[in-house]
Structure formats: C-alpha cells, structure tokens
Amino acid sequence: KSPIFGPEEVNSVEGNSVSITCYYPPTSVNRHTRKYWCRQGARGGCITLISSEGYVSSKYAGRANLTNFPENGTFVVNIAQLSQDDSGRYKCGLGINSRGLSFDVSLEVSQGPGLLNDTKVYTVDLGRTVTINCPFKTENAQKRKSLYKQIGLYPVLVIDSSGYVNPNYTGRIRLDIQGTGQLLFSVVINQLRLSDAGQYLCQAGDDSNSNKKNADLQVLKPEPELVYEDLRGSVTFHCALGPEVANVAKFLCRQSSGENCDVVVNTLGKRAPAFEGRILLNPQDKDGSFSVVITGLRKEDAGRYLCGAHSDGQLQEGSPIQAWQLFVNEESTIPRSPTVVKGVAGGSVAVLCPYNRKESKSIKYWCLWEGAQNGRCPLLVDSEGWVKAQYEGRLSLLEEPGNGTFTVILNQLTSRDAGFYWCLTNGDTLWRTTVEIKIIEGEPNLKVPGNVTAVLGETLKVPCHFPCKFSSYEKYWCKWNNTGCQALPSQDEGPSKAFVNCDENSRLVSLTLNLVTRADEGWYWCGVKQGHFYGETAAVYVAVEERKAAGSRDVSLAKADAAPDEKVLDSGFREIENKAIQDPRLFAEEKAVADTRDQADGSRASVDSGSSEEQGGSSR
C-alpha cells in the first residue's frame, strides 16, 4: 500500500482556487526526491502538470504552484482560475509518475449557481443555524409573512406568521417579527440539513403589492481535515463545535459503509470495543470543545471520523459536525512493542515502553487507563521519582535500556492489576502507547520469603530461589526506592532445592545485610535480567526491630508452623496468596511463596498463537 496520502475528492466552483496537500513519510530520501502532480489519462498514463523540479505545463502556466514542506512531510499544490475543464482524476506523488508512490485525487469543478438578481446568498455549515432576513414595506406590516422553498418549478410553503410549519422543519424553525420600528422579519432555521439547501423566497403580503426577497441557502458538508499518523502511534482529534452546543452530548464516530457512522466514543459513556484501553476523551472546555486521543493505531483505524453534538450521543441529521480523514502510515517510525503482557498472581511483569529517541531528556510516565470515566489515566510512576502511594515497593520505572525504550516493572501482582496501561512522555504526543496486563493461572517463578524482620546490629541473609529456566540470566538483588532499584551485592549459594524436576541449573542467590541499621528497612527485590532487559522480579519487605537475642538471622522459605491463611504443601513449603502489602509490618513475618513444580511456563505466560505482539512476564 502506498504511504502517500491526500484528499480523495476536491470540489470547487468555476473561477475559484484549490489547495491540495499531499503527505509522505518524511524519510531523508523522500524529503529530497521529486514531487509531482499529474492528470490521469483514459489509457492509464499520468501526464505531469507541475513538479518540484520546476516544470509547469502550459495548461497551468501562471495559475499553479507546487511547494514542498520537507520538515512536515507534505507538499502543497495550489491551482487558481479553475474551469470545468479541470475536472478529472489526478495523482500526487513522489519520484517517477509510474512508480506507484502516489495517491489518487478526484477534482470536481462545477458551474457557479445561476442566481436571480437581488438574491442574498447564505453559506452555512451542516448542523448550524441560519437567519434569513426579509425586509418589507409599511403597507405590509400587518399582513401575513411567509417563507417558501422552490422545489422544482413550484414554491412550497415552509413557515408563515399564522403558525403553519412545514413538517420537514418541525422543531427547528421559527419566524420572528422585529419590533414596530424595524420593517423586517426573519426566519431562523436550526440543525441545518443538506436537504435544506436551495432557493427560498420570503414574502410579506399576498396581493400584487406584496414584498418579496430571494435567498439562496448553501449548506456545506465539512471538508475532512487530513490526518497522517504512524502505525502503532497516536492521534488526537480536537473537536470545537462552538459554545451553542456546550451542554449537548458529544461523540466521535467512524463512517462505515454508506451514511452509517459507528460511535467510537461519546460523553454518555459509550465506547466501541475495538478501542477499549486505547482511547481517551479529554473533558470539554467551557466553550464545549473537547479532544479524543486514540493510541496504538492499527491499519483498520484508517478512515473518516466525525465528531459532533447531539442529545443521543450519536450522529443524527442536523448534528453540527467536524470531519477528519485518518491515514495510517505503515512505514512507521514507532517500533513494535508487546501490546499484551502476561503475569501470574504474586508474580511480576516487565513492560517495555517506546519513546521518541530524540527526546531522551523528556519525563517518562506510566499511567493506568480508566474505562469508567472517559478521560482519565492517573499517573502511577514517572522517571522523576514519583510513585503513587499504593504502589510503593512494587513499581519502578527504569530509563533502561534507553535509546528510545524505557522499562516499567510491576511485581506482587494481583487480579486487580489486570487492565490497560499507557506509556507516555511530556514530549512527542504521537508516541503514546498502550499495553494490556493480563493475569493468568500459574505460580511465580522466583521464590522469596514473604516479609522478613531483621534485628538492629545483626546480620540478615535473605534467599531468592531461581528455577533452571533462568540459568543463562543475570541474577540480582536490589533495594527499591522511588527513583529505581539500587543494585546490592549478593552471593550465589549453589543449586536451589525449592524446585522439583529442576537440575543443577537452579540457583539460590542470597542477599546479606551486615550490621543492620534502621536505614536498611524497606523493600528489596530479587530479579533476573539479560543486559539492559529486565525479566521477573520478586519483592520482600525487611522490617527492622530492636535486638532481643544475639545472633544472625538466616531466613528460609519454610517454617514449621503455617499461619492460618496458608496451606502446607507436600514438600513442607507454605503457599500463600501474595497480596499487595500496604504496610507490611502489619503482617506476620516471613510469609513464604513456594511451588512444588518447576513451572517452566508458569509465570512466563506463553505467547498466544493469535498475536505476534505479546510477551510473558519474564525478560525477552
């Protein structure tokens, strides 16, 4: 599919001008290559009329130009003094006319309307309001006032001062007679429809002395604004319909076959399932304007979008609207990243977030998409060290691996963590991406004690058991804080006995805290990584208390007496539900997480065959 994009249809009137914008991916080659505008012949060729290399056909001499805007990835063709002979099929493109890097444009030039003398022309947008003014003389001040519409050869009564209203205008028309001083009546028509366009006649009086005034009403369908965005990127539709509809329900819909327009999102709470998790409606300003952001753009998102206002929250005849034609460029600069990441209860996920590598200094954010309200994505963590209070100890945003990607790690997963999350920065708004976290059946791969109490001045050793599947990974311990997780020295204690059916490649890696101080209290993570790519993590809270009896503490996974909320497994390990701990000191010490099997694919959820963009909770 060609990545060149422009308007499919351009309509104008004889004598007027048009400006046609064509979009292209702004690669270095594209920016500098030849741009052209050509007319398609009946036998398939395309004859150049104007190009960026200076050529102008004699047909266009003195009335057309082509300007390239390489920084925007656009070029614009302006054509003046249009005639009906200019109607036809054209292409705007890059390189050689026959190469296929082009977009088809249909230009339709119509004759101007043949208007009667003394005709007032009213040009109004679809869905808006028009006021037709009708002057009269004093002798007709007390006589009947009326407005007719010319239908074919016959005038049809639309409204009159005796109270008649044509059924086609019910509920959206009124006739106002100005105060005695002004010899003028006016007809106001709201929620204009395309069918309202035409010739009108207003009249005061019914005899030969009546006053008449001709009016021509042109109802304009909004020209769609062209929007060119990258696959996997983000688009924002800014919708400003005017203060008169500030209190009316707003919607964004996508035109399907014919005149149908399927609601994508509206302010009444409706949202199309295809956009779940990747659309937000920003609340409206006082003037009634609002915006809709769609992220994770797909090929099938391309098409015509309308925003509008109507009490039903969907397109109806007479809704004021704004239109866009969205083109999704498949030659995207935005890299593929998993759209679904899976983890198990008690386990963890590591999410990779792409950003524009030109903006390495921008603030990175990770927020939780909220479906209940149309426009919320509350911040959970940022690259400046802010972490939402409820996520302390289990969430971290790392600038690694860098160069256009950052990492977010979330552990101590529960079913409540399932949902959609957005990666964004305070820079390029096109680089907003969405990831869905799914919680699946299985056990965490890393085994650590639940939470641990250390004694001031003593030594504490905390174990972390890694199954053999992580034999080739780097294993680490770190201390969590709100700016990341600071690496700590750890000791490899040899093979772990925490896994059944697991060979010598399983590992027990311990964290040792010597001469424990109050500053050692906090969250500790053990985890695996490969270079700058992070995999699973497990968290332990270490509380610090006053000395009771001398000696060092060596924390193990198993303990003879199981707490009431734990069940003892055959192997003597205890299994608990690893809940997100608000204040770990309120919980019994040394809760354990264990598993009697090596769940080779337990927490590293397997990739669904239906999707090429899913990753498990483990590292890549």
């Epitope: 920003n282 927020c367 994505c377 911040l379 060290g385 802010w386 972490v387």
Partner: nanobody, 131 residues
Framework: QVQLVESGGGLVQAGGSLRLSCAAS????????MGWFRQAPGKEREFVAA????????YHADSVKGRFTISRDNAKNMVYLQMDKMKPGDTAVYYC????????????????????????WGQGTLVTVSS
C-alpha cells in the same frame, strides 16, 4: 484536599534578601509539584519558580534567574523561596501553589510555569521592596 500557608513576607530594601516559606498540610501524598507565583498591583499573576516534589527538579522564571532559588523539604512538607538581590519590581503578593499528579491526558503536557497546572493555592504573603 491540600492546604497551603505562606509566611516570611515583609518589607525589605533593594539589594536585600528574604526567605518565603510554604507549609503544606492535608493530603500531601497527592502533591506532584509546587510553585511560587506573584501578583503586583494591577498586574496579572505571574510565574516565579517551581519544583517537582519527588526529584526536586527546579524551574525559574527568566526575570528571577540567578537571584531567586526554590527548594523543598519533603519530610516537613515545606517549600521555600530564597530571594536575593531584590529589586523594587519584585514587590507583589507571593502565592504558593501545588499540583496533583496528572490524571487527564492534558495534564501530562502542562508546563510548571502555567497557572492552570496548579490545583491548590495559598492566601498569599505580601513582599514590598523599597528603593
């Protein structure tokens, strides 16, 4: 809700120094950033300085750069504005402001110097610089 109370205003001679304090109370865990603004008689409220609550990244208006310094003490929920080399043009009511963490997409692109970025405001403290 977050409550903000400014203190430290007063009369100072040109070239002198003053330190303003702002005490935050209430739901301080929701604070994402804080700032100082000022409003001179008959003029609009203008940005002076801002600081991010967690990282302490600072922003200063060009008109005060090199003279004013914003700082914070998270443990005490305090923000300070150290004003040195003061000028008569610095005379104004100084307001402390706090912002919540972003929630709406538009919040993520708001700048620390924009008044609309802030959700909570103090009553203000008057600073007069005499020549």
């Amino acid at each position: 809700q977050v409550q903000l109370v400014e203190s430290g205003g007063g009369l100072v001679q040109a070239g002198g120094s003053l330190r303003l304090s702002c005490a935050a109370s209430g739901r301080t865990s929701s604070i994402y950033g804080m700032g100082w603004f000022r409003q001179a008689p008959g003029k609009e409220r203008e940005f002076v300085a801002a600081i991010s609550w967690s990282a302490g990244r600072t922003y200063h208006a060009d008109s005060v750069k090199g003279r004013f310094t914003i700082s914070r003490d998270n443990a005490k929920n305090m923000v300070y504005l150290q004003m040195d080399k003061m000028k008569p043009g610095d005379t104004a009511v100084y307001y402390c402001a706090a912002r919540r963490a972003p929630e709406l997409l538009s919040d993520y692109t708001q700048k620390p110097e924009e008044i609309g970025t802030y959700h909570y405001w103090g009553q203000g403290t008057l600073v007069t610089v005499s020549s």
